[in-house]
């Protein structure tokens, strides 16, 4: 507010207080409460009384700056109030409130007694910003096939209330709610999506903005969507390759999933022939014989689901006249 000179002084003083309506400081920083008397060169400041103004109780003295006695800090503010470092102008009644805490937020006033101009006073509001410490909590495990599901929630508490938003390429919806406390507010934002495998590995970033932060705070969560693709078998594209004596024949089971799936091979009409080796998703055959003909089943599974795909292997024997006709007709 505009400093109010004392009426009824009967003096034509052009003096005024230079101050600030609002002083903003971040929690833990020192707050400078300004109160500088700008007057004529021959005027003197006798004392500056600083008080914290309570709307109901009255006022609590912080300190008294006296031209003769120096700085006197009231017991409640001992070790917390000092004058700005030298050099100091004798007309400067400003004080430093060290290590500002939330309880310091409120209204303050300085009352300046000058000679010969009389008294002046000004008041200001101290605002203590409490920067948030955001936390991100992933939602329940995401699985392809679910409907709209909570991917993550992000909570930040501060004073004033922080802003919580999401930065991501993933399609989804965000909703926020806020809880007011006596001196702060907690904001929680939730991000919901319909899980799909294309979201796997995509970043979901919580962005927290607050006047007490030099830059936005960002916490990134990498999306994991559980899924299991249909299985298929590769290796039988050219049946003519599956003939007796061929070496290095393999069947490869194709699938993908999150978490990565495990593979297993079985033979439908009996055990796997001797010499046939299972190596993860691949079934390796020794030199082919007609014994290797049969129905092979690839089993794919992860924590979410399991899939299977089967193929019929027919090993051709060029020596077998009955099969020669098939070969010719197949070509």
């Amino acid at each position: 507010g505009k400093p109010i000179p004392n009426p009824l002084l009967g003096l034509d003083s052009t003096g005024e207080l230079e101050t600030s309506d609002l002083v903003t400081v971040v929690l833990g920083q020192d707050a400078k409460l300004p109160c500088f008397y700008r007057g004529d060169p021959d005027e003197q400041v006798g004392q500056v009384a600083w008080a914290r103004v309570d709307p109901n109780e009255g006022t609590r003295e912080l300190a008294l700056l006296h031209s003769k006695y120096g700085l006197h800090v009231s017991p409640a503010y001992e070790d917390r109030v000092e004058q700005p470092p030298p050099p100091r102008d004798p007309l400067d009644g400003s004080i430093l409130l060290r290590n500002a805490v939330q309880a310091d937020e409120g209204e303050y006033e300085c009352r300046v007694s000058t000679f010969p101009a009389g008294s002046f006073q000004a008041r200001m509001r101290l605002r203590v910003l409490v920067p948030p410490l955001p936390s991100l909590n992933p939602g329940p495990p995401l699985e392809e096939g679910q409907g709209l599901t909570l991917a993550a929630s992000c909570t930040a508490e501060g004073s004033p209330a922080p802003s919580v938003t999401w930065d991501t390429e993933v399609k989804g919806t965000q909703s926020s709610r806020s809880f007011k406390h006596s001196r702060s507010a907690a904001v929680t934002s939730e991000f919901h999506l319909v899980p799909s495998r294309s979201m796997n590995g995509q970043p979901l970033t919580c962005v927290v903005s607050h006047p007490g932060l030099l830059q936005d705070q960002r916490i990134t969560h990498t999306l994991q969507v559980a899924f299991l693709a249909e299985a298929s078998v590769r290796g039988l594209e050219d049946q003519n390759l599956w003939h007796v004596g061929r070496e290095g024949a393999t069947l490869k089971c194709l699938s993908e999933g999150q978490p990565p799936p495990k593979y297993n091979w079985t033979r439908l009409d009996g055990p796997l022939p001797s010499g046939v080796r299972v190596k993860g998703d691949t079934l390796g055959f020794p030199p082919l014989t007609t014994e290797h003909s049969g129905v092979y089943v690839c089993h794919v599974s992860n924590e979410l689901s399991s899939r299977a795909s089967q193929v019929t292997v027919e090993v051709l024997d060029p020596e077998d006249p009955g099969k020669q006709v098939d070969l010719v007709s197949a070509s």
Epitope: G58, T59, H66, P75, E78, R111
Partner: antibody, heavy 120, light 111 residues
Framework: EVQLQQSGPELVKPGASVKISCKTS????????IHWVKQNHGKSLEWIGR????????IHNQNFMGKATLTVDKSSSTAYMELRSLTSEDSAVCYC?????????????WGQGTLVTVSA | DIVMTQSPTSLVVSLGQRATISCRAS??????????MHWYQQKPGQPPKLLIK???NLESGVPARFSGSGSGTDFTLNIHPVEEEDTATYYC?????????FGGGTKLEIK
Amino acid sequence: EVQLQQSGPELVKPGASVKISCKTSGYTFTEYTIHWVKQNHGKSLEWIGRINPKNGDIIHNQNFMGKATLTVDKSSSTAYMELRSLTSEDSAVCYCARSGYGSSYGFAYWGQGTLVTVSA
Amino acid sequence: DIVMTQSPTSLVVSLGQRATISCRASQSVTTPRYSYMHWYQQKPGQPPKLLIKYASNLESGVPARFSGSGSGTDFTLNIHPVEEEDTATYYCQHSWEIPYTFGGGTKLEIK
């Protein structure tokens, strides 16, 4: 309950000194400034000065510079005022006082007063 | 120093009537929020007792028949209806700056 208990009446000769005490109880001594007030017989009240018990900082009324010395003893939660070079003008009741809980201004608690009589 | 001028110096009021005591400061003792003016009651042989702080705030335990008003330089203490126990001397005091000063006092008598 906040209490300020002052020492008893004093009869002293001109030129001498006297030290009166103000023992406090019912609150944390170092959290409130102690003020001293003089009242001449049948007259008004005059603020002598104040002392911060936490650090011993003192502010006097200029009229009492050199006349009144304010001290505290934190261990006994007691404030003292010594008056020196006494004259008959110094004959008065002296009070110690303290502000209330909600604010620093207005003296909500007073000692019962100590009568100082300066007479040959 | 701020000079506090009280009037009248003495006052006689009938039981049940209104007593009005005035106090003028030599300069304003008011901020937009509060006036740094307080009122005390003193009975013989006793220390002063705080009645009103900040011009109009009744101190805890003080009867509601006491009220204070005013701002700037002019302040008033009202007692209505007066009772016999209100016989005392009343003082105003400012706490705007050091030194704090008191008014000369108003002696109230009830008839």
